[in-house]
């Protein structure tokens, strides 16, 4: 399977909400011995290997924000912890996988990574990730609502096995 990032750049005004999205593509094993671990984290731009560094999102680590379920099941974070920080990650039946950030601040700007780990019990793991940039802006030149920029077809399947 692969991870696609429909949008490579989100430009949002301070105070707005945004939902960053990744999508699982390709054949997904729905066997009983397969589960999917999905999560989000921040990383630094300009790394040799994108998303290799894991930084927290609003002080929450990738472990705090993870979803763990089988196949294309739906799931979302019910953690009070995440909600208290204005965050919610969710996954639907169609492989869409997102994190919603509420009340954006300038410090939310940066590179965001979604990570999907296919875990086969008693076997190997398969890891893929997608990356996108969030720019939070303020002042007269900031947009009044979030503006999203589609990934190029090459970028939208920007996967790196970890």
């Amino acid at each position: 399977f692969k991870v696609a990032t429909p949008y490579s750049l989100y430009v949002c005004p301070e105070g707005q909400n945004v939902t960053l999205t990744c999508r699982l593509l390709g054949p997904v094993d729905k066997g009983h011995d397969v589960t999917f671990y999905k999560t989000w984290y921040r990383s630094s731009r300009g790394e040799v290997q994108t998303c290799s560094e894991r930084r927290p999102i609003r002080n929450l680590t990738f472990q705090d924000l993870h979803l763990h379920h089988g196949g294309h099941q739906a799931a979302n974070t019910s953690h009070d912890l995440a909600q208290r920080h204005g965050l919610e990650s969710a996954s639907d039946h169609h492989g869409n996988f997102s994190i919603t950030m509420r009340n954006l601040t300038l410090l939310d700007s940066g590179l965001y990574c979604c990570l999907v780990v296919e875990i086969r019990h008693h076997h190997s793991e398969h890891r893929v990730h997608g990356a996108m940039e969030l720019q939070v802006q303020t002042g007269k030149d900031a947009p009044s609502n979030c503006v999203v920029y589609p990934s190029s077809s090459q970028d939208s399947e920007n996967i790196t096995a970890a």
């Epitope: 731009r45 300038l106 700007s109 939070v136 303020t138 002042g139």
Partner: antibody, heavy 116, light 110 residues
């Protein structure tokens, strides 16, 4: 376009103090504004920034010790309970650009001395 | 805690010479780095932002380079007016501290 700080003076420890930055030729609804300080003979230290929609961003060490606020043509920094370590020149500065950033216009500074 | 280390703390160079000032971050700040010049009794003046972009009105004798954790400010064809203290500042929004200045480098031009 200019910035001018005022309110710096000699205060005793624990006496609250408010510094004011008066802006000329700048619309505060367009720019984030901040405060940076410099102890005598020392380096620069970021304190806080306030955005056009009045979101505030403090250095971790400054949270609870300072309060930044703004009006139409002024930006205030309240030193809630000064200690001798707060003796410094306090600069008001304007942020460049629309995102988290750096300062491209500075005031001349105002000196705060905390001593008993 | 995040740190931004400037070296050297002081440097002396002749008029017409070249000086290099280094700024090292304890973790990657991408290219979110600015350089300032400060003369005694004056506020800082922005020289460079984005690690290498020259602020309008700043002479091209000043240049910045680097990314990640290692950055350099180079001043060539030194003039007496360049005598000042130089500071780097990181402004990577993903660093918890928000924004941090380096300790400064004093430049003496002989």
């Amino acid at each position: 376009q200019s910035l001018e700080e005022s309110g710096g003076r000699l205060v005793t420890p624990g006496t609250p103090l408010t510094l004011t930055c008066t802006v000329s030729g700048i619309d505060l609804s367009d720019y984030a504004m901040g405060w940076v300080r410099q102890a005598p003979g020392k380096g620069l230290e970021y304190i806080a920034v306030i955005s056009p929609i009045a979101y505030t961003y403090y250095a971790p060490w400054a949270r609870g010790r300072f309060t930044i606020s703004r009006a139409s043509t002024t930006v205030d920094l309240k030193v809630t309970s000064p200690t001798t370590e707060d003796t410094a020149t306090y600069f008001c500065a304007r942020w460049a650009g629309t995102g988290w950033g750096y300062f491209n216009l500075w005031g001349p500074g105002t000196l705060v001395t905390v001593s008993s | 805690a995040f740190e931004l280390t400037q070296t050297p703390s002081s440097v002396s160079e002749p008029v017409g010479g070249t000086v290099t000032i280094k700024c090292q971050a304890s973790e990657s700040v991408s290219n979110y780095l600015a350089w300032y010049q400060q003369k005694p009794g004056q506020p800082p003046k922005l020289l460079i932002y984005g690690a290498s972009t020259l602020e309008s009105g700043v002479p091209s004798r000043f240049s910045g380079s680097g990314s990640g954790t290692e950055f350099t400010l180079t001043i060539s064809d030194l003039e007496c007016a360049d005598a000042a203290t130089y500071y780097c500042q990181e402004y990577d929004p993903s660093i918890d501290s928000g924004s941090v200045f380096g300790g400064g480098t004093e430049l003496v031009v002989k």
